[in-house]
């Protein structure tokens, strides 16, 4: 805390300049009107003030907004929105993309911290969903963005919103969160050709059900080894031997070398052995000729 | 990596003179505005003298008229000429991008003026 001082003589700011930089912080204090400063914000991000004189600043700020600063000065904020905490945060109604645009450029190339998260936290409540433009912009600051978010959060992205995600935008996602957002790609993509859907619906891939990927074997897609690790096994184990082969196409070759990972290794363990065999890849685990397989999960659902 | 290492503090009597080297590497220094700091014992810091790549200077209203500020770039390194020096110099200078805003921080060269 800047002690409370006079300001000398002459040294009254009549504006937020340049010559601001030479002020100590009981200077800065004692000269600089809090009204002028949240009136002329836009032109602080552009004077290299130390980060102790940001936090006099800062400072005078919290003394005049004690409530949460008002749009039109958190807009123009720059390097002093790194001085923020999160409930310096909480306190501010954003609405407007262009401002949430503003900060993010500041903490641009740094990892997502926890005021970053708390403006995104504030910014799309606010919006009630997040809607296109607003993933955009933040996939675009935060590659990992969407897959931060909780399967209840993620309910809230419309449809529409999916073609603005990346691939590498799903990178961490959990077969939790592509559950809820395949459905939506799906939806988003359902009027694209076969060729182009599988180009979109690919990154997704990890939260489709078992009949989605029997309907995608028939269309020739050639899905690669990569995708297919990433498919849930639950809805892998019940497709046929002839199916995999149909989804993979050429690809299938790189089933040998994953054949003890999952869900490949599991999936081996529910196919005929002889069918396997047809394959010619040498993927043993299958179930030997003359085995009766019973699936007690249907006989349960039949009584 | 941003390197600066100041160097020429010393010693001196009041009215004298002193000049200081700030030699930097690690980013492009003719790009790059530049700032003389200094931190007094039990005081703050305050910023002494600014020098910007297109070379337009600015100082401090204490030290205005007796220090200089000035830069060479063939060798990555910025000057700060004193004179007229009194005992109210004393402190520890750093010099600094004026883009990093972290002001007085580091070794920095110290520099005693004694009546």
């Known amino acids: 805390e800047v002690e409370k001082t006079a300001c000398p003589s002459g040294k009254k700011a009549r504006e937020i300049d340049e010559s601001l930089i030479f002020y100590k912080k009981w200077e800065l204090e004692a000269c600089v009107d809090a009204a002028l400063l949240a009136t002329q914000m836009d032109r602080v991000n552009a004077i290299p003030f130390t980060y102790e004189q940001l936090d006099v600043l800062k400072h005078k700020l919290d003394e005049l907004y004690p409530q949460g600063y008002p749009e039109s000065v958190i807009q123009h904020l720059g390097y002093l929105f790194l001085k923020m905490s999160p409930e310096d945060i909480r306190k501010w109604n954003v609405t407007s993309l262009e401002t949430l645009k503003a900060l993010l450029e500041v903490n641009k190339g740094h990892e997502m911290s926890p005021q970053v998260a708390t403006l995104i936290d504030r910014f799309v409540k606010g919006r009630g969903q997040l809607d296109k433009d607003t993933l955009d912009t933040l996939t675009a600051f935060y590659p990992g963005y969407l897959c931060s978010l909780s399967p209840e959060e993620l309910s809230s992205v419309p449809p529409s919103s999916i073609w603005a995600v990346r691939p590498q935008d799903l990178d961490t996602c959990d077969p939790r969160q592509l559950d809820v957002l395949y459905p939506k790609a799906r939806l988003a993509f359902q009027n694209m050709n076969g060729s182009e859907y599988f180009v979109k619906i690919q990154s997704f891939l990890g939260g489709a059900p078992t009949e989605d990927l029997k309907a995608l074997s028939q269309q020739n897609v050639s899905m690669d080894l990569a995708t297919f690790m990433k498919l849930r096994t639950d809805a892998v184990l019940p497709l046929t031997v002839a199916e995999v082969q149909k989804l993979l196409g050429p690809h299938v070759e790189g089933l040998k070398a994953e054949e003890r990972h999952r869900p490949v290794r599991d999936w081996i363990l529910r196919q005929r052995q002889d069918d396997l065999d047809t394959l010619g890849l040498g993927l043993q685990g299958g179930i030997p000729n003359g085995y009766l397989v019973l699936d007690l999960s249907m006989q349960e659902a039949l009584s | 990596e941003v390197e600066l290492v100041e160097s020429g503090g010393g010693s001196v009597q009041a009215g004298e003179t002193l000049r200081l080297s700030c030699t930097a590497s690690g980013f492009t220094f003719d790009d790059s505005d530049m700032g003389w700091y200094r931190q007094a014992p039990g005081d703050e810091c305050e910023l002494v003298s600014t020098?910007?790549?297109?070379?337009?200077?600015n100082y401090a209203d204490s030290v205005k008229g007796r220090f200089t500020i000035s830069q060479d770039n063939a060798k990555n390194t910025v000057y700060l000429q004193m004179t007229s020096l009194k005992p109210e110099d004393t402190a520890i200078y750093s010099c600094r991008t004026m883009a990093s805003r972290i002001g007085c921080w580091g070794q920095g060269t110290l520099v005693t003026v004694s009546s």
């Open positions: 020098i910007s790549s297109d070379g337009s200077t």
